[in-house]
Amino acid sequence: MASAGMQILGVVLTLLGWVNGLVSCALPMWKVTAFIGNSIVVAQVVWEGLWMSCVVQSTGQMQCKVYDSLLALPQDLQAARALCVIALLVALFGLLVYLAGAKCTTCVEEKDSKARLVLTSGIVFVISGVLTLIPVCWTAHAIIRDFYNPLVAEAQKRELGASLYLGWAASGLLLLGGGLLCCTCPSGGSQGPSHYMARYSTSAPAISRGPSEYPTKNYV
């Protein structure tokens, strides 16, 4: 029963992680303009994402522009886009694998196979979490490096945007959820060992025999 609870918690966490990951990838808030100079009057804030950039005026009016050419984009942005999409697809695949092996489904009857599918889905979710983490950490590293680079102009410096925090949360949830799913079925499934114990214990006596009780004809 506890195993089923862990599975449900694991899959709920991964679903939350997936939604967070989707929002993180979609929102244009990976990098936010950092106005540091004390003589600068802030008239607008610039948000930059994987797919578009937005300018928020002091009046509250927001204008967004989708990036035009894929080939003209920086390679790190292209890589971040690709990893984000792959991470989301991998997590979806993990969900399908989980559903096939979930206790409440009849896709697979054999308990061993179910446990293996749940374990596989857990591993897939962990992979998805790692894939989500890579572009987020890479972008954060670039922002921090720029921030402390004395030759990067203040106007070019950025701050960590909300999408990065969502990305970290998404990654954490996917890793945690995937980890829980992996833990619900140790060594080929949580039900495996106790199931075999029960089967074999019926043919064995309640108390073990001493050496003198074994038939001597079996010994040379």
Epitope: A142, R145, P150, V152, A153, Q156
Partner: antibody, heavy 119, light 107 residues
Framework: EVQLVESGGGLVKPGGSLRLSCAAS????????MSWVRQAPGKRLEWVVT????????YYPDSVKGRFTISRDNAKNSLYLQMNSLRAEDTAVYYC????????????WGQGTLVTVSS | DIQMTQSPSSLSASVGDRVTITCRAS??????LAWYQQKPGKSPQLLVY???LLVDGVPSRFSGSRSGTQFSLTISSLQPEDVARYYC?????????FGSGTKLEIK
């Protein structure tokens, strides 16, 4: 108009010391990162040192680390470069440079001051 | 240290010609590259930063581009006042190094 005027250059013997100054005008000095870049005769430009706007952070390449010290006096709108243990390879024109709010890298250059290290 | 290899070392072209100077970084520097123009007897002047962005007041005939670790400065139509030495410089990480320069002359 941004003005950067270097002074303090001259002839010095190997192992000697020299202090370069840069007088800044036409902008709010304490808002900007400042640097020194040098150019040996007929050679490529070489970054020497950078100091943050407040003076709290300094950046040096290995070639001058431990020998050169950058400092600034924001009240006097002045930048300084203290050069110790000078070598023949330090012979160059030394440029005082101001960073910019909008532009990366070395945005505004002074006219330079010549430092000659020779016995 | 990141090495900047600039080519050609010198270049002679006619007024109106399209001229391209290239600079290759020994490792990835993203777009952290600047181009400078140094006229004879003068201090260098910043032309381009972030590999493609033109400084205000620089004629639009100048343009910068990037392809991986190779960077280019192009003058679409060479003018007599463009006679100078051009330097590239990376500012990806310390130490910030310059290219060896390209001397541009008019034929």
């Amino acid at each position: 108009e941004v003005q950067l005027v270097e002074s303090g250059g001259g002839l010095v013997k190997p192992g000697g010391s020299l202090r370069l100054s840069c007088a800044a005008s036409g902008f709010t000095f304490n808002d900007y990162t400042m640097s020194w870049v040098r150019q040996a005769p007929g050679k490529r430009l070489e970054w020497v040192v950078t100091i943050s706007s407040g003076g709290g952070r300094t950046y040096y390449p290995d070639s001058v680390k431990g020998r050169f010290t950058i400092s600034r006096d924001n009240a006097k709108n002045s930048l300084y470069l203290q050069m110790n243990s000078l070598r023949a390879e330090d012979t160059a024109v030394y440029y005082c440079i101001r960073g910019d709010y909008r532009y990366d890298a070395f945005a505004y250059w002074g006219q330079g001051t010549l430092v000659t290290v020779s016995s | 240290d990141i090495q900047m290899t600039q080519s050609p070392s010198s270049l002679s072209a006619s007024v109106g010609d399209r001229v391209t100077i290239t600079c290759r970084a020994s490792e990835n520097i993203d777009s952290y590259l600047a181009w400078y123009q140094q006229k004879p007897g003068k201090s260098p002047q910043l032309l381009v930063y972030a590999s493609t962005l033109l400084v205000d007041g620089v004629p639009s005939r100048f343009s910068g581009s990037r392809s991986g670790t190779q960077f280019s400065l192009t003058i679409s139509s060479l003018q007599p006042e463009d006679v100078a030495r051009y330097y590239c410089q990376h500012y990806y990480s310390e130490p910030y190094t310059f290219g060896s320069g390209t001397k541009l002359e008019i034929k």
